[in-house]
């Protein structure tokens, strides 16, 4: 798996370089996770030709995956930095159970799946430091998450393929929207 941002040999070898700002570190972290998702999607696509499925399919599923909406204040129209940051952190916390589900879904990219999961935890920590209103962030209930995970793992193989595909695609879209919004902050 690729080395997480801030741990590559270039950072060690170039002490004279300006340290990354908080915003730069977050930006780099998100791009690193997006690269990991691309690698995982490649394996998923190769396994069962799932990547040609239509866009409408994303809406037509019973997974409660986090999604950006106008009210979240992350889009250019009606942009609200504080509301948006709360949405990004809350959304990432909600994605954690789905990232846990992905851990046993990859054969050749097992390390990559783990890297995406761990890097997301680090990203949440970065963003929590940036947030002023931590009280507004709701943490998912562990019991609810545990039963959701059990339910997802009990699905048949076709549904597990679909679920994997939907999680990766939704997570990618959520991170891309977050990246655009964070660059405005």
């Amino acid at each position: 798996a690729p080395v997480p941002p801030g741990e590559d040999s270039k950072d060690v070898a170039a002490p004279h370089r300006q340290p990354l700002t908080s915003s730069e570190r977050i930006d780099k972290q998100i791009r690193y996770i997006l690269d990991g998702i691309s690698a995982l999607r490649k394996e998923t696509c190769n396994k069962s030709n799932m990547c040609e499925s239509s866009k409408e399919a994303l809406a037509e599923n019973n997974l409660n995956l986090p999604k950006m909406a106008e009210k979240d204040g992350c889009f250019q129209s009606g942009f609200n930095e504080e509301t948006c940051l709360v949405k990004i952190i809350t959304g990432l916390l909600e994605f954690e159970v789905y990232l846990e589900y992905l851990q046993n879904r990859f054969e050749s990219s097992e390390e990559q799946a783990r890297a995406v999961q761990m890097s997301t935890k680090v990203l949440i920590q970065f963003l929590q430091k940036k947030a002023k209103n931590l009280d507004a962030i709701t943490t998912p209930d562990p019991t609810t998450n545990a039963s959701l995970l059990t339910k997802l793992q009990a699905q048949n193989q076709w549904l597990q393929d679909m679920t994997t595909h939907l999680i990766l695609r939704s997570f990618k879209e959520f991170l891309q929207s977050s990246l655009r919004a964070l660059r405005q902050m």
């Epitope: 069962s48 030709n49 799932m50 040609e52 499925s53 239509s54 409408e56 399919a57 037509e60 009990a154 048949n156 193989q157 076709w158 393929d161 679909m162 595909h165």
Partner: antibody, heavy 118, light 107 residues
Framework: EVQLLESGGGLVQPGGSLRLSCAAS????????MGWVRQAPGKGLEWVSG????????YYADSVKGRFTISRDNSKNTLYLQMNSLRAEDTAVYYC???????????WGQGTLVTVSS | DIQMTQSPSSLSASVGDRVTITCRAS??????LNWYQQKPGKAPKLLIY???SLQSGVPSRFSGSGSGTDFTLTISSLQPEDFATYYC?????????FGQGTKLEIK
């Protein structure tokens, strides 16, 4: 009323190709996973291939993998089975079927006979 | 691949009898087990899905049970129209294999 109508069967020589079609009506085709099941004369049912809703995944029995291709055209409400390198043992009645939300095959076509013989 | 083994392969019974057909999977398939009835020259008909759910329009004399690897189809009181071949099918794995069938004949 749900209807599945297969076509495209017939007599073909070993090594030849055929494309079966299954025209669907009476339900929202794109939302449904679909499959092909065959039955050789006097034998039991054999699951051949399946495609999940929207074409997320395509799946094949080992006996046909690499030779058969399942596909769907949601705009035409049609399921296809492209069969290449046909063998005598592929001779059977081919049924197209819809998957129920509980993962049983709840609606079946009337079947189309494929005969592979020289 | 998951193998599905039905027993018996054939059985003779009389109208009014209670009949049980079993199906065993070579590995756990949770409750992804379906039962079908097929009459000569006709397409199969779904009777039971998800191991124990009765398909709409199917008489209540048909019932299914089991989970994991062992499943049963029971016909509580055989009717003349029930003489047919019955198949189990798993839809848990990637390949949705059928059992070899059980032919139910009139005694």
């Amino acid at each position: 009323e749900v209807q599945l109508l297969e076509s495209g069967g017939g007599l073909v020589q070993p090594g030849g190709s055929l494309r079966l079609s299954c025209a669907a009506s009476g339900f929202t085709f794109g939302y449904s996973s679909m499959g092909w099941v065959r039955q050789a004369p006097g034998k039991g049912l054999e699951w051949v291939s399946g495609i999940s809703s929207y074409g997320y995944g395509t799946y094949y029995a080992d006996s046909v993998k690499g030779r058969f291709t399942i596909s769907r055209d949601n705009s035409k409400n049609t399921l296809y089975l492209q069969m290449n390198s046909l063998r005598a043992e592929d001779t059977a009645v081919y049924y197209c079927a819809r998957y129920h939300s509980g993962w049983g095959m709840d609606y079946w076509g009337q079947g189309t006979l494929v005969t592979v013989s020289s | 691949d998951i193998q599905m083994t039905q027993s018996p392969s054939s059985l003779s019974a009389s109208v009014g009898d209670r009949v049980t057909i079993t199906c065993r999977a070579s590995q756990s398939i949770s409750s992804y087990l379906n039962w079908y009835q097929q009459k000569p020259g006709k397409a199969p008909k779904l009777l039971i899905y998800a191991a124990s759910s009765l398909q709409s329009g199917v008489p209540s004399r048909f019932s299914g049970s089991g989970s994991g690897t062992d499943f049963t189809l029971t016909i509580s009181s055989l009717q003349p129209e029930d003489f047919a071949t019955y198949y189990c099918q798993q839809s848990f794995a990637y390949l949705h294999t059928f059992g070899q069938g059980t032919k139910l004949e009139i005694k």
